[in-house]
Interface confidence: low
């Protein structure tokens, strides 16, 4: 069953390569158990970048070596990106799934496109 | 009269707050001077940036304290705009006018966003 | 030093026209870069644009003249003229002819009056 | 047409001292003005253009400021041949259309 997603359109990565952004969902009842999945889509392609299950009320969880991080509050997810460089610029999408209990529910965001700029190296200090 | 000018939609400024693109504007006619201004759009606020008149054919020229620089060729006009901060972040509009022979032609784009991201300090060399 | 010379008579009768040359030298009336104007001042009175002319393109004149006058330039000939027709009184003034370089007039002839008078 | 208003229409004043004077255009003309000056018998000169920029040959002296609607020339202290009239003129939009001039005479 689809379920609406909301995202921002645009994100700036700071000159550490770290994005935040906020994945909203319309949640039609009471789950328990979501899963977040970050998508990429550059040039057709859509990669999977990240994802997490949590329980509700509960930190999300990414493997030791995601290059996401999260916070959930109610309906909306907290999510961080890092490791970014101006390469990854794209579009991130984000997809909820309410895992349980039934029935399933899925929605996905339009996309926030993330703007990653490569920072000057800091001059040698000799 | 009308006359149709494109831009892009999105331009990063890079780490050294240097953004650059291209205006390009559809000539209903063969003109010999033509002025651009580059207008910044931003909390509904409209203000100038810089502007150049320039004969066809040979460079721009913006005053000495410009944060504008430019070259033309043909129907398009290169603009980097330099001394950007992330508070610079806005709309930035291309406005062409052709300026002689009559008769005059005015067009304006629909805005380039620029996005500018504030480097990190590089660390104190001890 | 580019030097801007008028020429033509220095009296026209009403309802006649006016004609005026103006010779450029030490400067091409075919650069790119510059455009050749008419400027006029009558006895006691402030600056008023007549026109302006590209060699390339079409002259460019101030709405209130533009029924009466004709300006053109001729490159092989290095000059460029004006032409008034149907003058009035209201029309004697000092005639300047200029380069204009974009936005401002950056040389002027010595200027040339023209009175109308029967 | 766009208009250009000059003030004062006269100043007198005594060499050595500090001028100012303005030009209000009835619509915005971003920085598209230029300023003249004008001896008895002569043609005029361009002393200021793109509101601000000194043209070749013109003493220090000389200065315009603004942007928009209002102008200003600035002569930091008068000169003997510095009396005469100066006029503004816009070349932001059609026509060209000149102020009506200020006479600076000795005091």
């Known amino acids: 069953k689809a379920m609406h997603v909301a995202q921002p359109a645009v994100v700036l990565a700071n000159s550490r390569g770290i994005a935040s952004f906020v994945c909203e969902y319309a949640s039609p009842g009471k789950a328990t158990e979501v899963r977040v999945t970050v998508l990429r889509q550059a040039d057709s392609q859509v990669t999977e970048v990240c994802a997490a299950t949590y329980m509700m009320g509960n930190e999300l969880t990414f493997l030791d070596d995601s290059i996401c991080t999260g916070t959930s509050s109610g309906n909306q997810v907290n999510l961080t990106i890092q490791g970014l460089r101006a390469m990854d610029t794209g579009l991130y999408i984000c997809k909820v799934e309410l895992m349980y209990p039934p029935p399933y529910y899925m929605g996905i965001g339009n996309g926030t496109q993330i703007y990653v700029i490569d920072p000057e190296p800091c001059p040698d200090s000799d | 009269k009308a006359m149709h000018v494109a831009q892009p939609a999105v331009v990063l400024a890079n780490s050294r707050g240097i953004a650059s693109f291209v205006c390009e504007y559809a000539s209903p006619g063969k003109a010999t001077e033509v002025r651009v201004t580059v207008l910044r759009q931003a909390d509904s606020q409209v203000t100038e940036v810089c502007a150049a008149t320039y004969m066809m054919g040979n460079e721009l020229t913006f005053l000495d304290d410009s944060i504008c620089t430019g070259t033309s060729s043909g129907n398009q006009v290169n603009l980097t705009i330099q001394g950007l901060r992330a508070m610079d972040t806005g709309l930035y509009i291309c406005k062409v006018e052709l300026m002689y022979p009559p008769p005059y032609y005015m067009g304006i784009g629909n805005g380039t966003q620029i996005y500018v991201i504030d480097p990190e300090p590089c660390p104190d060399s001890d | 030093q580019l030097q801007l010379q008028e020429s033509g008579p220095g009296l026209v009768k009403p309802s006649e026209t006016l004609s005026l040359t103006c010779i450029v030298s030490?400067?091409?009336?075919?650069?790119?870069?510059?455009?050749w104007g008419w400027i006029r001042q009558p006895p006691g009175k402030g600056l008023e644009w007549i026109g302006t002319?590209?060699?390339?393109?079409?002259?460019y004149y101030d709405p209130s003249l533009k029924s009466r006058v004709t300006i053109s330039v001729d490159t092989s000939k290095n000059h460029f003229s004006l032409k008034l027709n149907s003058v009035t009184a209201a029309d004697t003034a000092v005639y300047y002819c200029?380069?204009?370089?974009?936005?401002?007039?950056?040389?002027w002839g010595q200027g040339t009056l023209v009175t109308v008078s029967s | 047409e766009i208009v250009l208003t000059q003030s004062p229409a006269t100043l007198s004043l005594s060499p050595g001292e500090r001028v100012t004077l303005s030009c209000r255009a009835s619509?915005?003309?971003?920085?598209?003005l230029a300023w003249y000056q004008q001896k008895p018998g002569q043609a005029p000169r361009v002393l200021i253009y793109?509101?601000?920029n000194r043209a070749t040959d013109i003493p220090a002296r000389f200065s315009g400021s603004g942007s928009g609607t209002d102008f200003t020339l600035t002569i930091s202290s008068l000169e003997p041949e510095d009396f005469a009239v100066y006029y503004c003129?816009?070349?932001?939009?059609?026509?060209?259309?000149f102020g009506q001039g200020t006479r600076l005479e000795i005091k």
């Open positions: 030490g400067g091409s009336t075919s650069s790119n870069t510059y455009y």
């Open positions: 003129q816009q070349r932001s939009n059609w026509p060209i259309t």
């Open positions: 002319i590209h060699y390339s393109g079409n002259p």
């Open positions: 200029t380069r204009q370089y974009i936005n401002f007039f950056d040389f």
């Open positions: 619509q915005s003309i971003s920085r598209y």
């Open positions: 793109d509101a601000s």
